[in-house]
Structure formats: structure tokens, C-alpha cells
């Protein structure tokens, strides 16, 4: 079959090869499209409601005055010339619609380095077939799920026209010390070949570099974290940042079920209080930051306590404050 692509709403003429140029003609068109149930036969005599959709012209060609999505399918013509020789024509018709120029909506004017940011949402309306949206950074294609790039896509179909609306939301994590004014654009690639991509106007958000946080200091009293049974340990979490962040406490890597407080008092220490404690400062703008961990231990009378109760600063691990 010969592949034919036709733009929605435009006329289409399909030639019936081998047909005499003028009547009388012995020919028949067979259609299997979205408008038909199995095969529909059209003859030069025509007439009836089909004439508004497709009719046979005097030269035997099939004329569709305005192609629609339902006209996609197979068109066959069987013609016999004056000498009785039979010729068959076979067409596979596909339709398309070029959407309006895609647009970036809800675009960010500023991104924060080192954390995921929504750049914007690319919208293309009125395509057929659906086609695809892709993002570009400084003219180069961005690959989702690589280097802090994620894309959330949505495709909707108009209930009446059957045309597609595509949406693509771009999230990126700009590298610290990277380009302070990256250029993002989005392009629509049609679902049918031989049609060029349509590109949005570019956007150039600023990249803001957060000032590195000063370290969260965990102060233990008594120093070293070793205490006699029944003694009291006071843990204080010192964060230089303003405004003061929320401070939660961890024991052995697990959040303690307490409200935020910069001070944790452990009175009358018993064996069950022994363990590794740390504090987590949660800033509204930076996310959680954990202190070094300190080891709280009980020293029996006559024992020498360790000189330092700290263990290496642990990462956040599976931090999920309820």
C-alpha cells in the first residue's frame, strides 16, 4: 500500500489507477476507516450521506473535501480499462495536525543549586497524532533520570476534536558552581515523520547558590558522655543559623518520639539510656542537617570514662521524622 499523509481539515484526492478518464467507467472504491464497519463500497454513481465525506469524481478519483481523524485507514480502488485489464490501487491514509507553538508555563525565575527545582511546564495543544515533548538545556537535549533531571508527562485527548494536549513538567537539580543563567527550551516533535519540530521561546532562570550551612554542634554535659548510674546527661544542639531551625533528636539512628527542642535532658541515667545520640536541625529552606553522634555510656564506680564520647558524624540514613 502507498502511504499518504493528509492534514486534518484539508481536501484529499486519491487517484484510481487504470480507470478510464471519463465515464462510463467500471470501478469501485473500498474503504476501511474509522467511519466504516469493515469495508464500505463507493461507486461512481454515489449519492446519499457519504457524498459529504467522500465521493467519486468523474475521472474516477476519490475526493475527500475535509479529512478528519476518522478517515485514517485503507482505501482501495479496483478499475477495469476499456480492454478489460484490471488495475488495483491501494492507499494507507494517515492524518495529522500540527499543534500551535508549544509554550512554557509556570516557569521558575530562580532555581536553587543542589536541590530539585521545578523549571516549568511545557504545553502543546492540538496535535495529532500525539507526538512528543522534549526539553533542552543550552540547546542540548536533556535526558530524564540522568544527572538530577526528571520529567513528569501527561497526555490528554479532547473529547470532541480528538486532538491531543501534551504537558511535560521539568525538574532539575542544578550543580553547585554551575551555569548561573542556564537556558531551557522545550520542543514538540510530531508523531508523523517529515515534519520539523516546533520549539518554545527559551527561559533563563537564575541559579541561586545557597550559602553552605555552618555545622550543627552537639554539646554533651558531662563532656565525653560517660556518666555514673543515676547521673544526668544534658545534650544541647547548637545551630548558628537564623531563624532557629527545628531540632529533633535521634538515638541509635532512630528519631526519638519527642517534640522539637534544642536540649535533651536524660535524668537518672540507666542502662536503657546508653547509646548513640545525635540531633537533626531542619531548616525551612535547606532540609535536615545532622550533627555528629555522641556515645552516652555508664561508667561503674572506679572506671575511667572515655576521653571523648563522639563517633564519626553519621549521614542522615533513613531519617523519617513522624
Amino acid at each position: 500500500a502507498q502511504n499518504i499523509t493528509a492534514r486534518i481539515g484539508e481536501p484529499l484526492v486519491l487517484k484510481c489507477k487504470g480507470a478510464p478518464k471519463k465515464p462510463p467507467q467500471r470501478l469501485e472504491w473500498k474503504l476501511n476507516t474509522g467511519r466504516t464497519e469493515a469495508w464500505k463500497v463507493l461507486s461512481p454513481q454515489g449519492g446519499g450521506p457519504w457524498d459529504s465525506v467522500a465521493r467519486v469524481l468523474p475521472n474516477g478519483s476519490l475526493f475527500l473535501p475535509a479529512v478528519g481523524i476518522q478517515d485514517e485507514g485503507i482505501f482501495r480502488c479496483q478499475a477495469m480499462n476499456r480492454n478489460g485489464k484490471e488495475t488495483k490501487s491501494n492507499y494507507r491514509v494517515r492524518v495529522y495536525q500540527i499543534p500551535g507553538k508549544p509554550e512554557i508555563v509556570d516557569s521558575a525565575s530562580e532555581l536553587t543549586a543542589g536541590v530539585p527545582n521545578k523549571v516549568g511546564t511545557c504545553v502543546s495543544e492540538g496535535s495529532y497524532p500525539a507526538g512528543t515533548l522534549s526539553w533542552h538545556l543550552d540547546g542540548k537535549p536533556l535526558v530524564p533520570n540522568e544527572k538530577g533531571v526528571s520529567v513528569k508527562e501527561q497526555t490528554r485527548r479532547h473529547p470532541e476534536t480528538g486532538l491531543f494536549t501534551l504537558q511535560s513538567e521539568l525538574m532539575v537539580t542544578p550543580a553547585r558552581g554551575g551555569d548561573p543563567r542556564p537556558t531551557f527550551s522545550c520542543s514538540f516533535s510530531p508523531g508523523l515523520p517529515r515534519h520539523r519540530a516546533l520549539r518554545t521561546a527559551p527561559i533563563q532562570p537564575r541559579v541561586w547558590e545557597p550559602v553552605p550551612l555552618e555545622e550543627v554542634q552537639l554539646v554533651v554535659e558531662p563532656e565525653g558522655g560517660a556518666v555514673a548510674p543515676g547521673g544526668t546527661v544534658t545534650l544541647t544542639c547548637e545551630v548558628p543559623a537564623q531563624p532557629s531551625p527545628q531540632i529533633h533528636w535521634m538515638k541509635d539512628g532512630v528519631p526519638l518520639p519527642l517534640p522539637p527542642s534544642p536540649v535533651l535532658i536524660l535524668p537518672e541515667i540507666g542502662p536503657q539510656d546508653q547509646g548513640t545520640y545525635s540531633c537533626v536541625a531542619t531548616h525551612s529552606s535547606h532540609g535536615p542537617q545532622e550533627s555528629r553522634a555522641v556515645s552516652i555510656s555508664i561508667i561503674e564506680p572506679g572506671e575511667e570514662g572515655p576521653t571523648a564520647g563522639s563517633v564519626g558524624g553519621s549521614g542522615l540514613g533513613t531519617l523519617a521524622l513522624a
Epitope: 533528636w249 538515638k251 532512630v254 528519631p255 526519638l256 518520639p257 519527642l258 517534640p259 522539637p260 527542642s261 536540649v263 535533651l264 535532658i265 523519617a320 513522624a322
Partner: antibody, heavy 117, light 109 residues
Framework: EIQLQQTGPELVKPGASVKISCKAS????????MLWVKQSHGKSLEWIGN????????FYNLKFKGKATLTVDKSSSTAYMQLNSLTSEDSAVYYC??????????WGAGTTVTVSS | QAVVTQESALTTSPGETVTLTCRSS?????????ANWVQEKPDHLFTGLIG???NRSPGVPARFSGSLIGDKAALTITGAQTEDEAIYFC?????????FGGGTKLTVL
């Protein structure tokens, strides 16, 4: 509807132990702290301790350390409190309450524990 | 250990505004005490009203509000109703220790 269903009244002998339960329904059990509170007859409320059902981590009022043990069973969305070495001082109504660290919005109906020989 | 003090009893009339307070023996109550207010009705029916000083629990009528007044935590009922007759407990967090007040018996006549 969010509910905390507690076990019925308990009559126990001095020196014995009792384990009371608090079954949560209508919300995600592991998303909230469970808080336990004691109300002695004619007295105010006393905080016993908290448990984080997600991790099983606990924190106790010093007064109840060694007296109360808090546990959870995530599969049945149930929190438990065991009270050991019971004396007449432990006769009270015990409540569980759902908390998101600083709120206690939903409370159980309470479990009355009577310690008597 | 800190002591939390409340009015032992208050009386109001329907439609009136009434304020219950909660004082700390350690000094001024601040937002770091996460003041809570809990209502007890007959038959040991407890409901959390306010948490974190001024956050109303879901489903609690808007006539209940929490605040700090001077150096105390306060619960204000604007337009009291007869069904608000109950005992109201406040609770304050002190770092990692929770202390309840003695409760205020509110009568709505």
C-alpha cells in the same frame, strides 16, 4: 472515623503485671506518635511516655521508667503498655492518645486498672 | 520538676467569652512549650482541642482558640455553649518532659 479502642477494666493482684492495649483505626498507625497518660482517682493527668510506631522508639517519664514498657504491633495497628510490679498506687485509668509530637487530638476511652488482693 | 497551674474552676454564661490560663513554675510559657489543651467530659471522654500553642485539632469548633497571654498559655472560648461545660487540662512540654496542669472545671450556666 479515627478511633483508639482500649481494653476493658483489669483487676490485678499486687506484685503482678498487666498489659493493656490500644487498637488504632481510621488513620495510618505509623504516621503518629502514641502517647500514654495516667489519671489517678481525683487527681490530674500524668504523662507516662511516648512511642513512635514506625521505629518502635520510646521515651519515658522518669517516674515510669521500669514501671511501664511501651510496645507496638504494626501489623494489627495496636499499641501496648505493660505495667510491672503493681501496687495500689498504680490503680488508675490509663489512656492512649494519638500525637503528632505536640498535639494529642484523639484519645482512647481509657482502661481502668484496679490493684487489689 | 516543673509545676503547671490552672484556675481550679470558672463559670460563664452561654454566648459569653471565657479565657482559661496555664502558668509554668519555671517562668514564662513560650511557643517551645507547645501548649496543649485537652477537654474532659463525663465518663472519661477526652478530646484534644489545641496543640502547639495555637493549632486547633481537626474538627474542633472555631470558637476554641489558643494563644500566649503575657507569660501564660491561654484557651479562649468565644461564645461559650452549654456543651462546653467540662474539665479543661493544659499540658506543657519541657524539653523532653510533658507536664499536665490540674485542670479547670468550666461551668456554663
Amino acid at each position: 472515623e479515627i478511633q483508639l479502642q482500649q481494653t476493658g477494666p483489669e483487676l490485678v493482684k499486687p506484685g503482678a503485671s498487666v498489659k493493656i492495649s490500644c487498637k488504632a483505626s481510621g488513620y495510618s498507625f505509623t504516621d503518629y506518635i502514641m502517647l500514654w497518660v495516667k489519671q489517678s482517682h481525683g487527681k490530674s493527668l500524668e504523662w507516662i511516655g511516648n512511642i513512635n510506631p514506625y521505629y518502635g522508639s520510646t521515651f519515658y517519664n522518669l517516674k515510669f521508667k521500669g514501671k511501664a514498657t511501651l510496645t507496638v504491633d504494626k501489623s494489627s495497628s495496636t499499641a501496648y503498655m505493660q505495667l510491672n510490679s503493681l501496687t495500689s498506687e498504680d490503680s488508675a485509668v490509663y489512656y492512649c492518645a494519638r500525637s503528632d509530637y505536640w498535639y494529642f487530638d484523639v484519645w482512647g476511652a481509657g482502661t481502668t486498672v484496679t490493684v487489689s488482693s | 520538676q516543673a509545676v503547671v497551674t490552672q484556675e481550679s474552676a470558672l463559670t460563664t454564661s452561654p454566648g459569653e467569652t471565657v479565657t482559661l490560663t496555664c502558668r509554668s513554675s519555671t517562668g514564662a510559657v513560650t511557643t517551645s512549650n507547645y501548649a496543649n489543651w485537652v477537654q474532659e467530659k463525663p465518663d472519661h471522654l477526652f478530646t484534644g482541642l489545641i496543640g502547639g500553642t495555637n493549632n486547633r485539632s481537626p474538627g474542633v469548633p472555631a470558637r476554641f482558640s489558643g494563644s500566649l497571654i503575657g507569660d501564660k498559655a491561654a484557651l479562649t472560648i468565644t461564645g461559650a455553649q452549654t456543651e462546653d461545660e467540662a474539665i479543661y487540662f493544659c499540658a506543657l512540654w519541657y524539653s523532653n518532659h510533658l507536664v499536665f496542669g490540674g485542670g479547670t472545671k468550666l461551668t456554663v450556666l
